[in-house]
């Protein structure tokens, strides 16, 4: 039978005794920055071109004995996982290897930078098809390494990296923390986060998704026909690099933003046991395990969205947190979350010609997160409409008044430290879906978008008694763009989107006691694009 | 031995290029910053990536590197330019004493300087 990891990434319709992906990634070139490799291994011979690039530090220790098979071990295995004939993900992809790690698996930030520069220069000298760069390495947070990754990504290159094997927040490592890079954590055959000795896979908001990374069979540099199992986030990243190569081979025009959204969309959802992660990281860590799309074409009609969490604001009184979408994505809604419940809401604001989502901490709060809902919406024209706090007891309301604009998200932000907890709950007048409603002491922000064929609807789920979590999901064919809570009162910790479900969290009832105003309503805005659907049908 | 000769050549070149003149102070109001790895065992002091402002041309990068060498030589320090970056980020990789960081941060076009650090196979 096929190795568990190849079975896991194969969608059910392709499942058989063999791994038979629909396309082998033959139009794509994958660059591997790693150790040296054994290029005559039967898995990869003729598939991997060893470039003359080498930038590695000397090995530590005076008695270090350089043994070829040890020097090549890591890189050979990863090359096999990406494109190996027997145990590879993208069996048609061609690869180029650059040596940036020495025989002990150690390199430098500067050597990696020079390697990335080498790739960019190669791309300029001889433009080929889509490029994927696999970085199965990690160091401490590095501004310069992240900046280089950003530049290369903006030149149209897809970068995939290991989240790191430190059982820690991936945001503390580079290139894992670079927003433009696709950062991959590791899971095992039971879809659990991988433990590696006393450590394990990294986690947190800088991880985009997880992939198989334990007991992965692949080429061994011991001999030209040898295979071995290895584990780590490098192996997980290699799976995603292979999946990316296959997706790009099927649709070479995909942008990085489109590719990332598809990787997220086609992942297995909610299969990872989050109890493995530290409690404060669970909400930030994506519960996604990478998989191939069920078919290589026909995904274009869908409205794709993802959730982007900001860094923590920190606890100071005026602290704010900002979440940003990728350059090709539209910010369709903005929400906030605070574990202490002390926050002053969130707002969408322009920054450098693009909308960002900013959340505000409150006095005595431990800090907030901003949560952006970032979507692919071609030809979109979005704007934010704001209503200042209303004096009327009916609350503040704002709607999309421009012709053809639809409501994609609602945010509320208040200057007062505490919204009155005993104010009557605000009720939305029925039949006004294009309207955001909030507390009378809050300013309300409506995200209004015009895009061909875009239609949206509001879906609510209210629970009369206080509950820690209220959810509402969009139905099949609709995509969650906005997630907020009614009313915007202080016992609500915040709202955020998980896949296609809007989650509203409230303070633990046992600690707050019952309030007269325990009702919490989760409000989801669900959208779809008829235009994208039509365009897809015309293509087919 | 080879390295020592190389360093000697660098010093000669650096002294010769003093005609480049003193470094002007960076543009008013912009201060270059220094970054280093938060994980101490992973730090590689003595090697620095000097990152220049976004629109800096290759010739300016080379000139800035030579200027750093000249000013360092005047203070009795040997420096070695290991690589000049262009294509992704403008800047250069330099082997030098940490004593020269203050000087380097004042060079024109400098955006920030990062001490080199280790990366590891995962």
């Amino acid at each position: 039978s096929i190795p568990w990891n190849l079975e896991r990434i194969t969608p059910p319709r392709y499942r058989a005794d063999e791994y038979q992906p629909p396309d082998g990634g033959s139009l794509v070139e994958v660059y591997l920055l790693d150790t040296s490799i054994q290029s005559d291994h039967r898995e990869i011979e003729g598939r991997v071109m060893v470039t003359d690039f080498e930038n590695v530090p000397e090995e530590d220790g005076t008695r270090f004995h350089r043994q070829a098979s040890k020097c090549d071990s890591h890189g050979t295995h990863l090359a096999g996982v990406v494109s190996g004939r027997d145990a590879g993900v993208a069996k048609g992809a061609s690869m180029r290897s650059l040596r940036v790690l020495n025989c002990q698996g150690k390199g430098t930030v500067s050597g990696t930078l020079i390697g990335l520069e080498f790739i960019r220069k190669s791309q300029l000298v001889q433009p080929v098809g889509p490029l994927v760069v696999l970085l199965p390495l990690a160091g401490g947070y590095s501004r310069v390494l992240n900046a280089a990754c950003q530049r290369l990504a903006r030149a149209g290159v897809v970068l995939v990296t290991a989240a790191g094997n430190f059982r820690d927040d991936a945001c503390l490592y580079s290139p894992a923390s670079a927003p433009e890079v696709i950062t991959v954590g590791a899971t095992n055959a039971q879809d659990q986060p991988v433990t590696l000795g006393t450590l394990g896979t990294n986690f947190g908001r800088c991880v985009d998704l997880f992939a198989p990374g334990e007991d992965i069979i692949g080429a061994s540099s011991d001999c030209s026909t040898c295979f071995v199992s290895q584990s780590g986030t490098s192996q997980a990243a290699a799976h995603v690099a292979g999946i990316a190569a296959m997706m790009l081979s099927a649709e070479p025009e995909l942008t990085l933003a489109e590719l990332r959204q598809r990787l997220i969309h086609f992942s297995a959802k909610d299969v990872i046991n989050e109890a493995w992660f530290p409690e404060d990281q669970r909400v930030l860590t994506p519960n996604l395990v990478a998989a191939l799309p069920p078919s290589t074409h026909g995904a274009g009609w869908q409205l794709f969205c993802r959730t982007v969490w900001s860094a923590h604001s920190g606890p100071t009184r005026m602290a704010t947190a900002v979440a940003r979408c990728a350059p090709d994505e539209e910010l369709l809604s903005c929400s906030s979350f605070s574990r202490s419940g002390k926050r002053r809401g969130e707002r969408m604001e322009a920054q450098g010609g693009k909308l960002v989502c900013r959340a505000h901490n409150a006095f005595g709060g431990e800090g907030v997160y901003a949560i952006a809902r970032c979507c692919l919406l071609p030809q979109a024209n979005c704007s934010v409409h704001t209503a200042p706090p209303a004096e009327a007891s009916m609350g503040t309301r704002v709607h999309c008044h421009q012709q053809g604009h639809v409501l994609t998200g609602c945010s509320s932000h208040w200057e007062v430290e505490d919204l009155g907890t005993h104010k009557p709950p605000v009720l939305r007048p029925r039949g006004q879906p294009n309207q955001c409603v909030g507390h009378r002491e809050a300013s309300i922000h409506a995200s209004c978008c015009h895009a061909p064929g875009l239609e949206c609807k509001v879906k609510e789920h209210g629970i009369p008694a206080p509950q820690e979590q209220v959810t509402v999901a969009c139905e099949e064919g609709w995509t969650l763009t906005g997630c907020s809570a009614l009313p915007g009162t202080s016992h609500v910790l915040g709202a955020y989107a998980v896949d296609n479900t809007c989650v509203v969290r409230s303070r633990d009832v046992s600690t707050t006691g019952s309030t007269s105003e325990g009702a919490v309503t989760a409000v989801a805005i669900c959208c779809r694009s008829r235009h994208l659907a039509q365009a897809s049908q015309e293509l087919q | 031995q080879e390295d020592e000769d190389g360093d000697y050549e660098e010093l000669v070149l650096a002294l010769r290029s003093e005609e480049d003149g003193l470094a002007e102070a960076p543009e008013h109001g912009t201060t270059a910053t220094f970054h280093r790895c938060a994980k101490d065992p992973w730090r590689l002091p003595g090697t620095y990536v000097v990152v220049l402002k976004e629109e800096t041309h290759l010739s300016q990068s080379e000139r800035t590197a030579r200027r750093l060498q000249a000013q360092a030589a005047r203070r009795g320090y040997l420096t070695k330019i290991l690589h000049v970056f262009h294509g992704l980020l403008p800047g250069f990789l330099v082997k030098m004493s940490g004593d020269l960081l203050e000087l380097a941060l004042k060079l024109p076009h400098v955006d920030y300087i990062e001490e080199d650090s280790s990366v590891f196979a995962q």
Partner: antibody
Framework: QVQLVQSGAEVKKPGESLKISCKGS????????ISWVRQMPGKGLEWMGI????????NYSPSFQGQVTISADKSISTAYLQWSSLKASDTAMYYC????????????WGQGTLVTVSS | DIVMTQSPDSLAVSLGERATINCRSS????????????LAWYQQKPGQPPKLLIY???TRESGVPDRFSGSGSGTDFTLTISSLQAEDVAVYYC?????????FGQGTKVEIK
Amino acid sequence: QVQLVQSGAEVKKPGESLKISCKGSGYSFTNYWISWVRQMPGKGLEWMGIIYPGDSYTNYSPSFQGQVTISADKSISTAYLQWSSLKASDTAMYYCARDYYYKPLFDIWGQGTLVTVSS
Amino acid sequence: DIVMTQSPDSLAVSLGERATINCRSSQSVLYSSNNKNYLAWYQQKPGQPPKLLIYWASTRESGVPDRFSGSGSGTDFTLTISSLQAEDVAVYYCQQYSSFPITFGQGTKVEIK
């Protein structure tokens, strides 16, 4: 079920060309390597070479390099062994064999093709 | 090339008795990364293609009777038939698959005494 079916016995004259075949069924032919093994009358097994039908990558034993050509047509799940100029010493039973997954050892064998070269 | 040498060339054993075949490789086929020996054993009966019995030097292929066992490591290996049956009359080959070219031993003929 998984099987390899080889073409029938051949009687040829020295200097003639020949192409024998091995058709795979019951599995994804593209994803498994096929080896060719020679057994001369009353002798042992000799590995000749191997092909990966997915991309037609081949590896030959030095003893057979330049003497034979291994090829495959994945569209019809068939591997081939051919000679451009047969010699009397090529008289033997030729087996095709499928690799065990990611192990170059042979779990499925063809029934064999007897090639007789005689003037 | 790795040369495989089997001994004896032929072996006559009474029914129900133990048969032991040895195989030596000219270089080690044991690899440290997965601690496996890249050695297999095949059985070939007259007029039939060979059949895989053992791989990784000691792992029995599914469907193979448990009277067949493999042992050894590095360069020296043994195939043992614990209680010879009439249907075990055949030629047995060892094979290394650690590197190209793949090589076989010259074969050991097992007969009933």
